[in-house]
Interface confidence: medium
């Protein structure tokens, strides 16, 4: 399954993959 | 109830810049990216670019990067997009989308877009 | 970057099925949203991740996304149908794409 976007405020590596759970995208608010 | 709210049309001359706002209400603000999507006159939508709204922290096209600035004010729950160096083929309608949060990408809420015209 | 290619028109008599395709190189492993707007409006979710269906939406439409091609189906296609359909593409290489959008026209 493609991954999900993790919401704002999460940690993003620089092309929106998997981070802490896999398959989500980061919340608004993270570091990158 | 949910809506985002986008300011008025604008009239603008080649190599000015504009500032488009986009006032979110009935959600946490700070829960959502915040994209802008564009139309020109009887074409299809091209993304431009998204916000995060609680680091300020943006993601642009690479067809509006050096050109489009995004920016936020939390406390007012709003968020800006500024294009520079405007060019004809800049005349369009300009929407904010609201993105869902920890899904796929999808935009469950749009404003209603501000049209911007570019001429001499 | 992705190409998402669709049909420019697609017309149907009132009551058949629409089918609208968002074609793209493996679009099968992406995640796919249609989007429909109406003339002087902002676009609308419809369906999302390929085959969910958004709030308010009816059963009529539906989403199917494999290999390289994604279909939006609409049955018993209604007047008030008729609008711009636009495919639009997330994952994590190649940001937001939207495809060049379908106009359907529903006939009569």
């Known amino acids: 399954a493609p991954d999900t976007r993790p919401a704002p405020g999460s940690t993003a590596p620089p092309a929106h993959g998997v981070t802490s759970a896999p398959d989500t995208r980061p919340a608004p608010g993270s570091t990158a | 109830r949910m809506q985002l709210v986008q300011s008025g049309a604008e009239v603008k001359k080649p190599g000015a810049s504009v500032k488009l706002s986009c006032k979110a209400s009935?959600?946490?603000?700070?829960?959502?990216?915040m994209h802008w999507v564009r139309q020109a006159p009887g074409r299809g939508l091209e993304w431009m670019g998204w916000?995060?709204?609680?680091?300020?922290?943006?993601k642009y096209a690479q067809n509006f990067q050096g050109w489009v600035t995004m920016t936020r004010d939390t406390s007012i729950r709003t968020a800006y997009m500024e294009l520079s160096r405007l060019r004809s083929d800049d005349t369009a309608m300009y929407y904010c989308?609201?993105?869902?949060?920890?899904?796929?990408?999808?935009?469950?809420?749009w404003g209603q877009g501000t049209l911007v015209t570019v001429a001499s | 970057q992705s190409v998402l290619t669709q049909p420019p028109s697609v017309s149907v008599a009132p009551g058949k099925t629409a089918r609208i395709t968002c074609g793209g190189n493996n679009i099968g492993s992406k995640s796919v949203h249609w989007y429909q707007q109406k003339p002087g409006q902002a676009p609308v979710l419809v369906i999302y991740?390929?085959?969910d269906r958004s709030s308010g939406i009816p059963e009529r439409f539906s989403g199917s996304n494999s290999g390289n091609t994604a279909t939006l189906t609409i049955s018993r296609v209604e007047a008030g149908d008729e609008a711009d359909y636009y495919c639009q593409v997330w994952d994590s290489s190649s940001d937001w794409v939207f495809g060049g959008g379908t106009k359907l026209t529903v006939l009569g």
């Open positions: 009935g959600y946490t603000f700070a829960g959502h990216y």
């Open positions: 991740y390929g085959s």
């Open positions: 916000i995060d709204p609680v680091t300020g922290g943006t």
């Open positions: 989308a609201r993105e869902v949060t920890g899904d796929r990408g999808q935009f469950d809420k």
